[in-house]
């Protein structure tokens, strides 16, 4: 349905009235300053020029002010991920301003028409910083946009036409149609804040991508991948449900930005890690768990700003709920020779023992072919805190990468019956914290006995030569 | 003291129009939606809609879409209810309750309610 | 639309015993730690009232002798020990998605 002030242009049209001629209308945009943890609690409303409410609803001037930017709204009410980041930003920053703004008329259109209008939002916005900026104490460093989706765009227009430099903008997933490739006075970008940091959840290179897949801020932040969320899949929401739907998919990976990000508001003694890596295949492979020059950071609020750096990709696994913290671990296996292996591919399963826990078994994830007399390199993931890594149990299956394979396989085995069995020939394995940053080698336990035919196991322990203690962390980023 | 005062019970013909008022006390209208819920005579509650009291949208649940108008008056703090081109199963009472924009939006203040009975 | 089914249509219960009604939902009504379930009591020729709200909390000024619980699909509402004045309709209402949708009701009468 339409509203008062519909696109821009209405809006402008309306704003270069005369006085006198100005027809009686609201404001499409309204600022809620959150008073209380209480999420039914009705806040107060911000008014630009009148200080008054300031006064009375106890806007701490010194204080962190935090501006939650909603995003395009099929319902029209906001949405249940709402309060849960206004809770948590107050349970984090207990003397913080917490300010809701509110675009539902806006934002309650034709996606095209919500786009259009948030250039509008914007320039509110940043005339209400502006007029803030006119108070005693306050200062423009201390403000942080958190934009979700199309909010996400909407703070960067924020951070543009604000007099002076917001002092951080978070974009939650921001909004990829129609800003996909555009413009960077068009779309969030990291000249918009001194500091832009991203979390990208539901990117696609095929079909539609609700997020936008390329890097706009300072630091961009892709968990999964920033893809597919684990937790997110029709199963798992067929689980949750009587029925699970695309729709419930879409709103799952897409929301999960906002739910990482109050994560690392409420979850503080569980920080989630980034590495900065090229693209989501080498991180799968294992290759890019680095802290050295910066090139890992926390995720979410508690994110270092990243000076000289622009566009910088970062990747990381995450649990399917809070906390979303993993531990990763880089595994270097050198495969020295394969024996009978004829078309079959191996695949990989480690079971890590530590001081504090054992893992599951996990599958090494085959990203590219396994080489034979090479190092091959493993990305691997445990949810809980192991501790001291104290050994490691392997064994590995045949999985025929075709059903032709498979078939000349099956006709091999059967026309040479003595065929000896297939074997793999390990020796030792290296592995590296991504959270500790230490790297460790394990020897077979038996040096004489390190063939591994499929299905049976291969035990490892630390090297005698104990832990080789690299320390890459770097000063800006705290390691747990 | 929150309160949600609603006009008197209403006796129309079909056809005719019927429009309900809501007005409010205690609190600042525009802060919370106010929702429209409908009861027929021993029958459970149906909601409506809701109206956003600051911006003015209105919302109309799939069945009361056409006939159905909500509308304001913020400077009286009032909502009100339009039936169109009434039905003998418009027979029942509607309540107006508020709702918050934020949180989990149930509706913590109702009214009187008003009984509109429709008979030829 | 999330379907609410109540559970029973009417019940009787002597003064001072525990009356228990059920809500299941068509589907999770949970957000995160949050159940977007609410209970509310209407006598007849009365308006609705809140009584308890995100399945478990107490409304302002409801006795304490009210209490809900549950989470995900399935939901109750007790009353204990039940008194005079609790004779009426109890009806449960999801706010997880709109439209926000009411239960068929359980008439509680003293046996």
């Known amino acids: 349905s339409p509203t008062p002030f519909g696109p821009e242009g209405q809006l402008a049209d309306e704003l270069h009235k005369p006085k006198a001629i100005q027809t009686e209308v609201k404001p499409s945009v309204r600022f809620n300053l959150r008073t209380s943890k209480d999420p039914e609690h009705e806040g107060c409303y911000l008014s630009l020029g009148h200080s008054q409410p300031l006064e009375d609803c106890g806007f701490n001037m010194t204080a962190k002010t935090f501006f939650i930017i909603h995003g395009w709204t099929m319902s029209g009410i906001f949405e249940n991920w709402l309060h849960k980041l206004v809770s948590a930003l107050h349970t984090r920053e207990k003397d913080a301003n917490v300010v809701v703004v509110d675009w539902l008329p806006l934002a309650h259109q034709l996606y095209t028409d919500a786009v259009n209008n948030t250039r509008v939002v914007g320039h509110s916005i940043a005339r209400m910083l502006d007029w803030l900026q006119e108070k005693d104490d306050f200062s423009l460093g201390n403000v942080h946009l958190i934009g979700y989706s199309l909010g996400a765009h909407v703070a960067g227009y924020a951070g543009n036409f604000v007099k002076g430099t917001v002092g951080r903008i978070t974009g939650l997933d921001p909004a990829g149609p129609m800003f996909e490739g555009a413009d960077i006075h068009k779309r969030l970008s990291p000249d918009d804040a001194d500091f832009v940091d991203v979390l990208h959840t539901y990117t696609r290179s095929f079909g539609l991508s609700i997020g936008i897949q390329m890097p706009v801020g300072h630091i961009d932040i892709y968990p999964n991948g920033g893809d597919f969320q684990p937790g997110c899949g029709l199963n798992d929401v067929l689980g949750s449900m009587a029925y699970g739907t695309i729709t419930e998919v879409v709103k799952c990976e897409h929301e999960r930005a906002v739910h990482l990000f109050v994560d690392s508001l409420v979850n503080q003694d569980k920080p989630s890690f980034a590495f900065q890596c090229t693209d989501s295949n080498r991180f799968k492979k294992g290759i890019c768990l680095s802290c050295r020059k910066n090139r890992c950071n926390s995720i979410g609020y508690n994110a270092k700003k990243m000076r000289n750096k622009r566009n910088s990709k970062m990747y990381l696994k995450t649990r399917a709920g809070m906390p979303f913290r993993v531990y990763h671990y880089q595994m270097k296996i050198h495969v020295f020779s394969y024996k009978n292996m004829g078309e079959i591919e191996p695949t990989f399963y480690v079971t890590l023992y530590g001081t504090n826990a054992d893992s599951q078994t996990l599958p090494l994830e085959i990203v590219e072919r396994i080489e034979q007399n090479a190092t091959n390199t493993f990305l691997v993931y445990t949810e809980e805190d192991l501790g001291d890594l104290l050994k490691i149990q392997l064994t590995w299956e045949g999985a025929s990468q075709s059903w032709y394979n498979l078939w000349k396989e099956l006709r091999s085995y059967l026309s040479q019956p003595h065929n000896p069995g297939r074997e793999l020939n390990i020796r030792r394995i290296r592995v590296k914290s991504g959270e500790t940053q230490r790297k460790l080698t394990f020897c077979a336990e038996d040096p004489e006995n390190t063939s591994i035919s499929p299905g049976r196991e291969l035990w490892f322990r630390k090297c005698r030569d104990g832990w080789r203690m690299k320390n890459e962390t770097s000063p800006t980023v705290e390691l747990p | 003291q929150i309160h949600l005062v609603q006009s008197g019970p209403e006796l129309k013909k079909p056809g005719e129009t019927v429009k309900i008022s809501c007005k409010a006390s205690?609190?600042?209208?525009?802060?919370?939606?106010m929702n429209w819920v409908k009861q027929a005579p021993g029958k459970g509650l149906k909601w409506m809609g809701w109206?956003?009291?600051?911006?003015?949208?209105?919302t109309y649940a799939g069945d009361f879409k056409g006939r159905f108008a909500f509308s304001l008056e913020t400077s009286a703090s009032t909502a009100y209810l339009q039936i169109n081109n009434l039905k003998n199963e418009d027979t029942a009472t509607y309540f107006c309750?508020?709702?918050?924009?934020?949180?989990?939006?149930?509706?913590?203040?109702w009214g009187t309610g008003t009984t509109v009975t429709v008979s030829s | 639309d999330i379907v609410l089914t109540q559970s029973p249509a009417s019940l009787a219960v002597s003064l001072g015993q525990r009356a228990t009604i059920s809500c299941k939902a068509s589907?999770?009504?949970?957000?995160?730690?949050?159940?977007?379930m609410h209970w509310y009591q209407q006598k007849p020729g009365q308006p609705p009232k809140l009584l308890i709200y995100?399945?478990?909390n107490l409304a302002s000024g409801i006795p304490a002798r009210f209490s809900g619980g549950g989470s995900g699909t399935d939901f109750t509402l007790n009353i204990h020990p039940v008194e005079e004045e609790d004779v009426a309709t109890y009806y449960c209402?999801?706010?997880?998605?709109?439209?926000?949708?009411f239960g068929g009701g359980t008439k509680l009468e003293i046996k």
């Open positions: 109206i956003n009291t600051y911006s003015g949208v209105p």
């Open positions: 205690g609190y600042t209208f525009t802060n919370y939606g």
């Open positions: 995100a399945a478990s």
């Open positions: 309750a508020r709702r918050g924009y934020y949180g989990r939006r149930y509706f913590d203040v």
């Open positions: 589907q999770s009504v949970d957000y995160d730690v949050d159940s977007y």
């Open positions: 209402q999801q706010t997880i998605e709109d439209p926000p949708t």
